[in-house]
Every structure is written in C-alpha cells, then in structure tokens.
C-alpha cells in the first residue's frame, strides 16, 4: 500500500535570465527511494539514481545543475521554460510517486516564489 506523499514547491515564478530551484520531498513512507526522474512536458531533464548518481540530459547540460539534494536547479531561464515540471520518485517497495510544479518565467523584475515549500 502506498502511504507516502510528495510535497513540492508548488506554483513558482522566476525572472527571465535568472535561476530557480525545483524541489520535491517524499514523506510518510519508509520506502527506499531508488531513483528520481525530473521531467518537463514529456522531456527528460535529469535523473538522480541512488547508486549511479546524477545524469543530466545532453540538451539541458548547459542550463541544468543537480541539487540541492534530490532537487534540480534551472539556470539562464527563458520564457520558454514556463510550464509544468514533474518529479517522479521511484521507490521500493511502494512504486512510483509523482509531484507537480508549475513554473512561470516572467519578463518583469517582479517574481514571487510560492510559499508552500521552504527552501533553505
């Protein structure tokens, strides 16, 4: 039975040219996290595997940095980066948990972060 829940940064916004941290956290389960996939609208951004470490997709290598933790840092943001992002937690024995984050990249200098998840 899957008892875990995923908390995410929720709906967030950032300035064009800036950077943003995408963060998910799996709680309420003792399942072993074997891998976390980060996806954007049917595209693989990065994978963090418990044994193998990080793999960043070649087309995102210049703009995506692993971490902090199991999170992902997007850099040099453009308006085209606006959209849905998903963290897919592969766990054993529970199975797969998915979290959703919506990022809006703004032209203006006013970009407010969602407050549902505190990033240290």
């Amino acid at each position: 039975m899957m008892t875990g829940t995923i908390e995410t940064t929720g709906n967030i916004s950032a300035e064009k040219g800036g950077s943003i941290i995408l963060q998910c956290h799996l709680s309420s389960t003792t399942a072993q996290v074997t891998q976390v996939n980060w996806e954007q609208q049917d595209q693989l951004l990065a994978i963090c595997n418990a044994d193998l470490g990080w793999h960043i997709s070649p087309s995102f290598k210049d703009r995506v940095a692993p971490g902090p933790g199991l999170g992902l840092t997007l850099q040099s943001l453009t308006v085209n980066d606006t959209g849905e992002y998903f963290c897919i937690y592969h766990t054993y024995p529970d199975g797969t948990y998915t979290g959703r984050i919506f990022l809006e990249v703004l032209e203006s200098s006013v970009a407010e972060h969602g407050a549902r998840f505190q990033i240290p």
Epitope: T34, A50, D51, L52
Partner: antibody, heavy 118, light 107 residues
Framework: EVQLLESGGGLVQPGGSLRLSCAAS????????MNWVRQAPGKGLEWVAA????????SYADSVKGRFTISRDNSKNTLYLQMNSLRAEDTAVYYC???????????WGQGTLVTVSS | DIQMTQSPSSLSASVGDRVTITCRAS??????LNWYQQKPGKAPKLLIY???SLQSGVPSRFSGSGSGTDFTLTISSLQPEDFATYYC?????????FGGGTKVEIK
C-alpha cells in the same frame, strides 16, 4: 572499458535446460539493472527478462514466465539466465544488456546462440 | 502490452541522403523511447535514448524527436557505415517491447 561476455549457449533438445551466463567487467556491476534480450534467426529483438541492481526486482516476458529464471551474483559480477522446458521457438541469439537509470540499454554483449532442436 | 510499430520496414537510400524512420507506440510512452542500430552478426548499439538524447560517441548526424506516441529517427546525411537495421524500443513499462525494425539498404 565496459565489457559483457555471454556464454553457455549451445544445442539442446526440446524440454531440456540450459544456463546462460553474462560476465561483466569495467563497471560497478551491482549498481546496474541488467536485461536479457533475444533474437531469433532473421527476426527482430525480443526482451526476455530484467533484474534491478538495487532491489533485485525481477520481471519477465509472458513467453518465458514460469520457464526461465533471471538471477545475478554481484560478488562474481555475473548475470544468469536459467532456461527450462525449452521449446523450438526459444531458438535465438541471447544478449545481455546493461540498463542504467531504467530507461535505456547502453551496453550489450556479443550474444550466445541457443538452438533447441531434436 | 505496448505495441511498437516501425515504418517503413525497409528502405533503399544513397550515401548523402536524409533518412527518416518513424516509430509509433500503441499508447503514450512519454519520452521513454530508444533507438538502436544493428549490423549483421553484431549486437545492437544504442544511438538515441529518452527520445532525443544522443548517446556518447554517436555521430551528430543521428537525431531523435517525438513524445507521447509518435517518434522519429533521422539520419541527416547517410554514410556508408549507416547501412544497417534500426530498432525502436519503449522502456515505459514492462514488458519492454521493440519495433519490428527498419532495414536501411544501399540504393
């Protein structure tokens, strides 16, 4: 350098058994999921079975379920495929393949031929 | 099971030609699509993974695109060493399944 070397193929009668081995070198074997994929003469590729590295989770194609058993010995860096109740339609070249991140198979062995015939 | 349908099953082309091979999944598989090249008597070789990522060491004339159910492998300028059979494979769910293959022959 990553290397995968299959062995154990040969001629076997219908109903017989065979055990294939895949010796791995050049990488941390225990960290990777591994697969067996087969190819009948003149035909396409067919996935047979997989075993994960971290949890030992196993899955099989319906065509071999209950007859084939995939296993691994991380201390020997070796993947196995125990094949029982062999049928003529199991005749194929059997490849082992490494699967990082559970998405793609990046390295394959050279294959070993299994022929099931009376 | 997810069925993978490749087209065409074979094609004839000349060196320098642009070649396109398509692969269609029977249900959405997101980006979980890989392309392999196989030459006679040899093991398959990974070309493209996760729909569009070029495997290290593979020439840049190979590219992949698509998501969901429809995918494409493109060879921008066919070279003599590219004459081979190409397979797509989905890794979205088990059983893992391959397309039937596309044999690229010399015209």
């Amino acid at each position: 350098e990553v290397q995968l070397l299959e062995s154990g193929g040969g001629l076997v009668q219908p109903g017989g058994s065979l055990r294939l081995s895949c010796a791995a070198s050049g990488f941390t074997f225990s960290s990777y999921s591994m697969n067996w994929v087969r190819q009948a003469p003149g035909k396409g590729l067919e996935w047979v079975a997989a075993i994960s590295g971290s949890t030992g989770t196993i899955s099989y194609a319906d065509s071999v379920k209950g007859r084939f058993t995939i296993s691994r010995d991380n201390s020997k860096n070796t993947l196995y495929l125990q094949m029982n109740s062999l049928r003529a339609e199991d005749t194929a070249v059997y490849y082992c393949a490494r699967e990082p991140y559970g998405v793609w198979m990046d390295y394959w062995g050279q294959g070993t031929l299994v022929t099931v015939s009376s | 099971d997810i069925q993978m349908t490749q087209s065409p099953s074979s094609l004839s082309a000349s060196v320098g030609d642009r070649v396109t091979i398509t692969c269609r999944a029977s249900q959405s598989i997101s980006y979980y699509l890989n392309w392999y090249q196989q030459k006679p008597g040899k093991a398959p070789k990974l070309l493209i993974y996760a729909a569009s990522s070029l495997q290290s060491g593979v020439p840049s004339r190979f590219s992949g695109s698509g998501s969901g159910t429809d995918f494409t492998l493109t060879i921008s300028s066919l070279q003599p060493e590219d004459f081979a059979t190409y397979y797509c494979q989905q890794s979205y769910s088990t059983p893992l399944t391959f397309g039937g293959g596309t044999k690229v022959e010399i015209k």
